[in-house]
Amino acid sequence: YPNASPLLGSSWGGLIHLYTATARNSYHLQIHKNGHVDGAPHQTIYSALMIRSEDAGFVVITGVMSRRYLCMDFRGNIFGSHYFDPENCRFQHQTLENGYDVYHSPQYHFLVSLGRAKRAFLPGMNPPPYSQFLSRRNEIPLIHFNTPIPRRHTRSAEDDSERDPLNVLKPRARMTPAPASCSQELPSAEDNSPMASDPLGVVRGGRVNTHAGGTGPEGCRPFAKFI
């Protein structure tokens, strides 16, 4: 990783997962160690992401375990890269009227999608569900993200930095809190409200503002309602 990683100044140090969702299923975007990007029906260590907001709605997305940036080539294929290229690895984030998020390449205009087709983003368009994303807090115990390299000597602070180059596994305060009116807590399994209805156990939890800084409606997204 370059020392000037754009992620190190992230406004929110927490891990999140981006997932697509229909009424009955959900896929979490995951970036594998080899750079392959696909979806999983559940949170995995490879779907734990950091999202850093930049100016003008741009975001940088990184897989914590793969240590790769989410990038897009000129054909619209998404992949994980150790090298941060501002042209290929920054995405424009936009929230649709339905509360879902879309990400597209300002360079190539294609949408980030878990579907195989490559579609250009057009303002006002209604993208397919596999190109619309929601976000969830990480629910995987942080211990699963620790993969220390065996050492003969006592572990030093340097070893810690090797295991966690992005400094995301140490709790960090969110700089801009969400509005007080916006509950950031996950509904409990015993919650009987319609919002807790989640027969597949894949979409539990409210929308969280992964791109901290919003104070208006953008800072407090609706719950996704699934049957």
Epitope: T22, Y27, D38, G39, P41, H42, R119, P129, V202
Partner: antibody, heavy 117, light 106 residues
Framework: QVQLVQSGAEVKKPGASVKVSCKAS????????MHWVRQAPGQGLEWMGI????????SNAQKFQGRVTMTRDTSTSTVYMELSSLRSEDTAVYYC??????????WGQGTMVTVSS | AIQLTQSPSSLSASVGDRVTITCRAS??????LVWYQQKPGKAPKLLIY???SLESGVPSRFSGSGSGTDFTLTISSLQPEDFATYYC????????FGPGTKVDIK
């Protein structure tokens, strides 16, 4: 290569239950939802339900609520669909199909279930 | 729930003909539409995903188009092995199938 191999044909009496299996191979079983679809003789395709392979959670079409039970065994990469209180109109070919985000990309060969007294 | 209607329900055609099948959704489904081909006694086979993307290994004479509510499957030059039943399916909200279109020999 991806393969979904289903159990053999069954003949059942009305009121009985049937359990059909679908063994997956050639991919990471827990990375894809599995669906069940049925087709009555001479009729179209009817979606029955979906199972999350990692959690085992399911969601069924309203028509089958209370009668269909889907389970999975991750150790053998197998999903099961049990249909209870069988009636003659349940006579059909039952298919499992793998979900690939934007399509059902692989299907089992089908299991014929005949309900007859 | 979103309803899908297909037309025609059946058609007779000859080898070499251009065949067009339409699928209409009761509400907008973006491009989340899939086409399958099914032959008697066989499982459905994926032809087109995301309304217009050809599945790997499917002959290029098959093509899909449309977005929103109206979709089309076209076979540019019908071959003997193409006589089958064709189903559309929406993945926008649930996983409903259309009623099917049977293509038989004239």
């Amino acid at each position: 290569q991806v393969q979904l191999v289903q159990s053999g044909a069954e003949v059942k009496k009305p009121g009985a239950s049937v359990k059909v299996s679908c063994k997956a191979s050639g991919y990471t079983f827990t990375n894809h939802y599995m669906h069940w679809v049925r087709q009555a003789p001479g009729q179209g395709l009817e979606w029955m339900g979906i199972i999350n392979p990692i959690s085992g959670s399911t969601s069924n079409a309203q028509k089958f609520q209370g009668r269909v039970t889907m389970t999975r065994d991750t150790s053998t990469s197998t999903v099961y669909m049990e249909l209870s209180s069988l009636r003659s109109e349940d006579t059909a070919v039952y298919y499992c199909a793998r979900d690939y985000v934007d399509a059902f990309d692989f299907w089992g060969q089908g299991t014929m279930v005949t309900v007859s007294s | 729930a979103i309803q899908l209607t297909q037309s025609p329900s059946s058609l007779s055609a000859s080898v070499g003909d251009r065949v067009t099948i339409t699928c209409r959704a009761s509400q907008g489904i973006s491009s989340a539409l899939v086409w399958y081909q099914q032959k008697p006694g066989k499982a459905p086979k994926l032809l087109i995903y995301d309304a217009s993307s050809l599945e790997s290994g499917v002959p290029s004479r098959f093509s899909g188009s449309g977005s929103g509510t109206d979709f089309t499957l076209t076979i540019s030059s019908l071959q003997p092995e193409d006589f089958a039943t064709y189903y559309c399916q929406q993945l926008y909200d649930d996983f409903d199938f259309g009623p099917g279109t049977k293509v038989d020999i004239k």
